[in-house]
């Protein structure tokens, strides 16, 4: 079988859901002395990049101008050192939001309850759509989804406290582009002081691996790049719709 | 807001060359990675090839590797197509395109999907004939 170098890994800065017309960054970490980057959109070359000096960094950055409905979709990306190509990296799916309304969310039976209610969050929008989606801040990755008409519903069962924080819903036109998002709504769940000493509120910082870890080389990194490189992609988490 | 206005384009004799320009006016267009596109009749826009803001990176399609070559001029404002050995297959409407003026861009990035680029010039017919 043709040898292959391992795959990058793509990851979105800042966040994967990019209001239209905003820039969108997409950075692709693939190994020290890669003298070319790929990004491809749908199965299609959508920009190359050539770092210079190449032995100097670990990946690139691509940036998307002015996003849109028809940027957004499935990237990927690859590398190659010298003659030599990587495999694809895993398929990301960008988002552009802000299209066309904003939904209300609400909340039943409210936004304040105890430990172990049954609570059902309310999206409505009253454009042409029927998919809706919740998110809730710092978990955007973990989205919900619902269908209806002109409102989705989205049961949670009964609460614990590790369901406190605060919570936004898109209506979806299709797979990749969002509405506004509603305002949010905040969900306080009181529970006894063991449950809650337990479950501390979520951050409301991006999700930890919607960061560009790109590094520049030092002799260390050199040794351990390949060693580095494969393991995080073993582990790394990534999100598919 | 950035124009776009080529020319050069024309009748030549297969085997021949030409040498066509985008002329662009705004002041980002030294600092936007910009791309030859064109559509020949009957076909579907295709990638010719992309350079980046600052002219270090180029990107050509596999069938004109070699034989056409893109540039730039960031003092005046253009851009430039050479074409050698010229085809028959090679007829078709030439545009040139920029990118949107959002972002900040790497000194050697290109990009070579349409759907990249904001701004579109008229376009100039290019004729090989035989």
């Known amino acids: 079988p043709k040898q292959t170098l391992p795959k990058p890994i793509i990851r979105a800065e800042s966040t994967y859901m990019v209001p239209k017309e905003k820039q969108a960054t997409l950075c692709c970490q693939g190994s020290y002395g890669a003298v070319e980057y790929q990004l491809h959109f749908e199965g299609s070359l959508f920009a190359v990049e050539r770092p210079k000096p190449p032995e100097r960094i670990n990946g690139v950055k691509f940036h998307i101008p002015d996003m849109n409905s028809r940027k957004a979709g499935r990237y990927s990306c690859i590398y190659r050192v010298g003659e030599l190509w990587s495999e694809r990296s895993d398929l990301l799916d960008l988002v552009v939001t802000e299209m066309y309304d904003t939904p209300t969310l609400s909340v039943h039976p409210g936004p304040e309850v105890t430990s172990g209610e049954k609570v059902t969050f309310y999206c409505r929008l009253d454009t042409a759509t029927s998919m809706f989606l919740l998110l809730k801040e710092g978990r955007s990755r973990d989205v919900q989804r619902s269908y209806g008409k002109v409102q989705a519903e989205f049961p949670m069962g009964p609460v614990t406290t590790a369901h406190r924080g605060s919570y936004r819903c898109f209506g979806s036109y299709n797979n990749y582009a969002w509405s506004f998002p509603s305002e949010p709504v905040k969900l306080l769940v009181t529970g006894d002081i063991e449950n809650t000493s337990l479950a501390p509120t979520d951050p409301t910082f991006p999700d930890s691996w919607d960061t560009c870890l790109l590094t520049r080389e030092t002799g260390l990194q050199k040794d351990l790049a390949l060693w580095d490189h494969t393991a995080q992609n073993h582990h790394h988490h990534h999100h598919h719709h | 807001q950035v124009q776009l206005v080529e020319s050069g384009g024309g009748l030549v004799q297969a085997g021949g060359s030409l040498r066509l320009l985008c002329a662009a006016s705004?002041?980002?267009?030294?600092?936007?990675?910009m791309a030859w596109f064109r559509q020949g009749p009957g076909k579907d826009r295709e990638f010719v090839a992309a350079?980046?803001?600052?002219?270090?990176?180029?990107y050509y399609a596999d069938s004109m590797k070699g034989r056409f070559t893109i540039s730039r001029d960031n003092a005046k404002n253009t851009a430039y197509l050479q074409m050698n050995s010229l085809r028959l297959e090679d007829t078709a409407v030439y545009y040139c395109?920029?990118?949107?003026?959002?972002?900040?861009?790497?000194?050697?990035?290109?990009?070579?999907?349409?759907?990249?680029?904001?701004?579109w010039g008229q376009g100039t017919q290019v004729t090989v004939s035989s």
């Open positions: 395109a920029a990118v949107g003026d959002s972002a900040p861009y790497s000194a050697t990035i290109v990009y070579t999907d349409a759907r990249a680029y904001a701004y």
């Open positions: 705004g002041r980002t267009f030294s600092r936007l990675p």
């Open positions: 350079i980046s803001w600052s002219g270090g990176s180029t």
